[in-house]
């Protein structure tokens, strides 16, 4: 099935330069039990919550969020209203954390690209894509290299020399990602609760992040659980105005209820440990 991923895309609205929209999506097999959108950094690590979306209970949002909504079963959008004259959103990092069952919590961050033209951002695509400008450069380079190679090939054939093997010009998204962001790896450990996982919190190296508060106050039984298989995050997606990282989170951190069990079976948010293994504390 592959490792779950989260994509984040930030767009400036063409009609209103003070309006921004954050789009986030989850690529994975599990059921989403909660989405938290924050700005200024990841939730619980310096970020400030803008919205919380539960697939059945509803949505809660706080200024400057204007409207948070589900776009599909696995993606959300958050419209932001910037009342100030100078736009603070332009240089702000927005993060989306998806709590899913049974995978755990996965968080990614993104910001508006510096050179973004209003309204020109492509819609979020749930497949790995390269940034449009990079793709253009790479495409042109490829065509030129191919052309040069073909000319060399013809010239050398005329001279009756064996055709040299050309090194293909290809740059995959992993190579591109490595230039900008640290590759992510998340490890898991099982709690007594079969639906809970402990995470080593990963965030891109470009963000000043730390483990959420309360790591040390996990219930003692978590310390002597067998180590689960290490989960290596699959290649992040690069999209215009976005980057993706993944974090396999403590289901207790992700907080929220497995979808078909009702609120009472939800585990605990913010890495502070399960509430008697049925925690669920006031989200809005």
């Amino acid at each position: 099935a592959g490792t779950p991923e989260v994509w984040v895309q930030v767009q400036m609205e063409a009609t209103e330069l003070s309006s921004f929209t954050v789009h986030c999506g989850f690529l994975g097999p599990g059921s989403i039990s909660l989405v938290t959108v924050s700005w200024g950094g990841p939730d619980g690590a310096g970020g400030t919550k803008l919205a919380v979306l539960h697939p059945e209970l509803g949505t809660r949002q706080w200024a400057p969020a204007r409207q948070a909504r589900w776009e599909t079963q696995s993606s959300i959008s958050l419209a932001l209203e910037d009342s100030g004259a100078s736009s603070p959103f332009a240089n702000t990092t927005f993060c989306c954390k998806f709590a899913s069952f049974p995978e755990g919590s996965w968080e990614s961050c993104g910001s508006l690209p510096p050179s973004s033209d209003p309204g020109l951002s492509a819609p979020p695509t749930p497949v790995p894509i390269l940034r449009a400008d990079l793709a253009g450069i790479l495409g042109l380079s490829g065509v030129l290299l191919f052309g040069c190679g073909y000319l060399l090939h013809l010239l050398r054939r005329q001279k009756h020399r064996p055709t040299p093997r050309l090194q293909p010009s290809h740059t995959n998204s992993q190579a591109l990602t490595a230039q900008a962001w640290a590759p992510s790896q998340a490890s898991q450990a099982a709690l007594h609760d079969p639906y809970a996982t402990i995470n080593t919190s990963f965030c891109p190296a470009t963000l000043d992040t730390a483990h959420p508060n309360g790591w040390a106050s996990l219930p003692t039984h978590a310390a002597h659980q067998p180590q689960g298989p290490a989960a290596s995050a699959s290649t992040p997606i690069l999209a215009r105005g976005s980057f993706v990282s993944v974090e396999n989170g403590l289901y207790t951190q992700a907080g929220e209820r497995p979808p078909h069990t009702g609120p009472g079976l939800t585990l605990f948010p913010d890495c502070r440990g399960p509430r008697a293994l049925e925690g669920r504390f006031g989200v809005r």
Partner: antibody, heavy 114, light 113 residues
């Protein structure tokens, strides 16, 4: 088990203010909103607003804007609702709640009478 | 604001019989993106705070007996108690969980006939 425990009943004069507290235990206080809902005697439920304790972000019902203030103290896991310029029609049971109204405090009866 | 209207205002049903409460919203509570209806039902007994019974129009809260069920979509919703028990005597409220501000129905008082 998450519990929300509210302060005791209050009797207030018209024009005065009342401050109701809601202490949370058994959960991560700063992660989720505390909602405030009131219920006048024999009447239905009316949402007053909410506060997100971690950031003190708030949303208010337009009807109460300017008269109600929400605060939260994360060191004591306590949220507060202060309602000013009280009038007789503010006589009601005031509830705090959380997680999309899944958890509720026991309620605080505020009586406004001259 | 979304206006929630319940019917009937009061209802008397014999023990073991079916009780049905209706709720109508002034705007659709269906989110077209994920096809979920954002409506909740609460039970309130005298002197107690409300208790969440149903959310997402049809999902029972943990610990709620399966005689309680919710149905409906868009603007019309129903709470059904398949076999009324004495402890079900209460006031029932529906609530818009779709958009701000959260709004409640006026309540339906359920009694035993």
């Amino acid at each position: 088990e998450v519990q929300l425990v509210q302060s005791g009943a209050e009797v207030k004069k018209p024009g005065s203010s009342v401050k109701v507290s809601c202490k949370a235990s058994g959960g991560t206080f700063s992660s989720f909103s505390i909602e405030w809902v009131r219920q006048a005697p024999g009447q239905g439920l009316e949402w007053i607003g909410e506060i997100l304790p971690g950031s003190n972000s708030t949303n208010y019902n337009e009807k109460f804007k300017g008269r109600v203030t929400f605060t939260a103290d994360t060191s004591t896991n306590t949220a507060y609702m202060e309602l000013s310029s009280l009038r007789s029609e503010d006589t009601a049971v005031y509830y705090c709640s959380s997680y999309w109204f899944a958890y509720w405090g026991q309620g605080t009866l505020v009586t406004v009478s001259s | 604001d979304i206006v929630m209207t319940q019917s009937p205002d009061s209802l008397a049903v014999s023990l073991g019989e079916r009780a049905t409460i209706n709720c109508k919203s002034s705007q659709s509570l269906l989110n077209s993106g994920n096809q979920k209806n954002y409506l909740a039902w609460y039970q309130q007994k005298p002197g107690q705070p409300p208790k969440l019974l149903i959310y997402g129009a049809s999902t029972r809260e943990s610990g709620v007996p399966d005689r309680f069920s919710g149905s409906g979509s868009g603007t019309d919703f129903t709470l059904t108690i398949s076999s009324l028990q004495a402890e079900d005597v209460a006031v029932y409220y529906c609530q818009n969980a779709h958009s701000y501000p959260p709004t409640f129905g006026q309540g339906t008082k359920l009694e035993i006939k």
